[in-house]
């Protein structure tokens, strides 16, 4: 039984150019997490495993960076950013566990973060 | 077109070390990362380790217990392999392979390098 | 470390024969697993990975399907050329292994 809950960074809104850190955490539940997906829609941006390390993807090497810990920061960001991410929870034994993230990248200064939440 | 064009084959003695270059062109040689392969004559394929071009981080398969070390020259867009204290059953052909996009497979290989171990 | 296990070792097959080969592993590996044809002195060529997207160029008769831990490799209507080695290998962690490979020779 999957027992775990995905807490995420929520509705977070950056300014054009600027950095965001993208961050889920797996909280409730004692499965082991062996590798976590970062997507943006059906893009894969990067994955974290646990034996291997980062992969980050070719097209996005340049301006993503890993870390802090499973998160991911997108770098030199453009309104083209905005839109939906997830975080995808590899676990073992439980299976997977997805968190989303809306990220809207704002032309002007008046960037600010929105709660955090908890997706079950 | 990407290609991966290794260096020719060695024969090397028994606690001897032996170092395989691997070229990389077609690509942005730091956007992928490096794996390398063997093969020992009619046997399967054998993981190694994998480096990141851009930061010379390595990662390592146990089974060759600190006797791999992996390195690049990024001016050169050149993989290294080394493998130390050699022993007959090291006698393989050896492959760098290029990390998928999406992924820790391996999307193209090099020709390979013949490496035989003997006295 | 997960096990790999590919069968059959071997296959004798015809031209224009479907052939299905497997691969089971130890524990969930999801979707990763890719597939290679190797042919006798060359480097393996990938033809799938998170097992079911086609690589580059790889012609439509072949096909991967599978998760968690029962994988597949079909080849629909066999050609003369696709006669060679075929190894899975997970891409999920260290050490990256390779089943056993299976040889599809010509009955």
């Known amino acids: 039984m999957m027992t775990g809950t995905i807490e995420t960074t929520g509705n977070i809104s950056a300014e054009k150019g600027g950095s965001i850190i993208l961050q889920c955490h797996l909280s409730s539940t004692t499965a082991q997490v062996t590798q976590v997906n970062w997507e943006q829609q059906d893009q894969l941006l990067a994955i974290c495993n646990a034996d291997l390390g980062w992969h980050i993807s070719p097209s996005f090497k340049d301006r993503v960076a890993p870390g802090p810990g499973l998160g991911l920061t997108l770098q030199s960001l453009t309104v083209n950013d905005t839109g939906e991410y997830f975080c995808i929870y590899h676990t073992y034994p439980d299976g997977t566990y997805t968190g989303r993230i809306f990220l809207e990248v704002l032309e002007s200064s008046v960037a600010e973060h929105g709660a955090r939440f908890q997706i079950p | 077109e990407v290609q991966l064009v290794q260096s020719g084959a060695e024969v090397k003695k028994p606690g001897a070390s032996v170092k395989v270059s691997c070229k990389a062109s077609?690509?942005?040689?730091?956007?992928?990362?490096m794996h390398w392969v063997r093969q020992a004559p009619g046997q399967g394929l054998e993981w190694m380790g994998r480096?990141?071009?851009?930061?010379?981080?390595?990662k390592y398969n146990d089974n060759f217990k600190g006797r791999v070390t992996l390195t690049v020259d990024k001016s050169t867009s050149t993989a290294y392999m080394e493998l130390s204290s050699l022993r007959s059953e090291d006698t393989a052909v050896y492959y760098c392979?290029?990390?998928?996009?999406?992924?820790?497979?391996?999307?193209?290989w090099g020709q390979g390098t013949t490496v035989t171990v003997s006295s | 470390d997960i096990q790999m296990t590919q069968s059959p070792s071997s296959l004798s097959a015809s031209v224009g024969d479907r052939v299905t080969i497997t691969c089971r592993t130890s524990?969930?590996?999801?979707?990763?697993l890719a597939w290679y044809q190797q042919k006798p002195g060359k480097a393996p060529k990938l033809l799938i990975y998170?097992?079911?997207t086609f690589a580059e160029g790889v012609p439509s008769r072949f096909s991967g399907s599978g998760s968690g831990t029962d994988f597949t490799l079909t080849i629909s209507s066999l050609q003369p050329e696709d006669f060679a080695t075929y190894y899975c290998?997970?891409?999920?962690?260290?050490?990256?292994?390779f089943g056993q490979g299976t040889k599809l020779e010509i009955k």
């Open positions: 392979a290029r990390e998928g996009g999406f992924g820790y497979y391996f999307d193209y």
């Open positions: 077609g690509y942005t040689f730091t956007n992928y990362y």
């Open positions: 480096i990141d071009p851009t930061s010379g981080a390595t």
């Open positions: 524990e969930n590996i999801f979707t990763y």
């Open positions: 998170n097992a079911k």
């Open positions: 290998q997970h891409h999920y962690g260290i050490p990256l292994p």
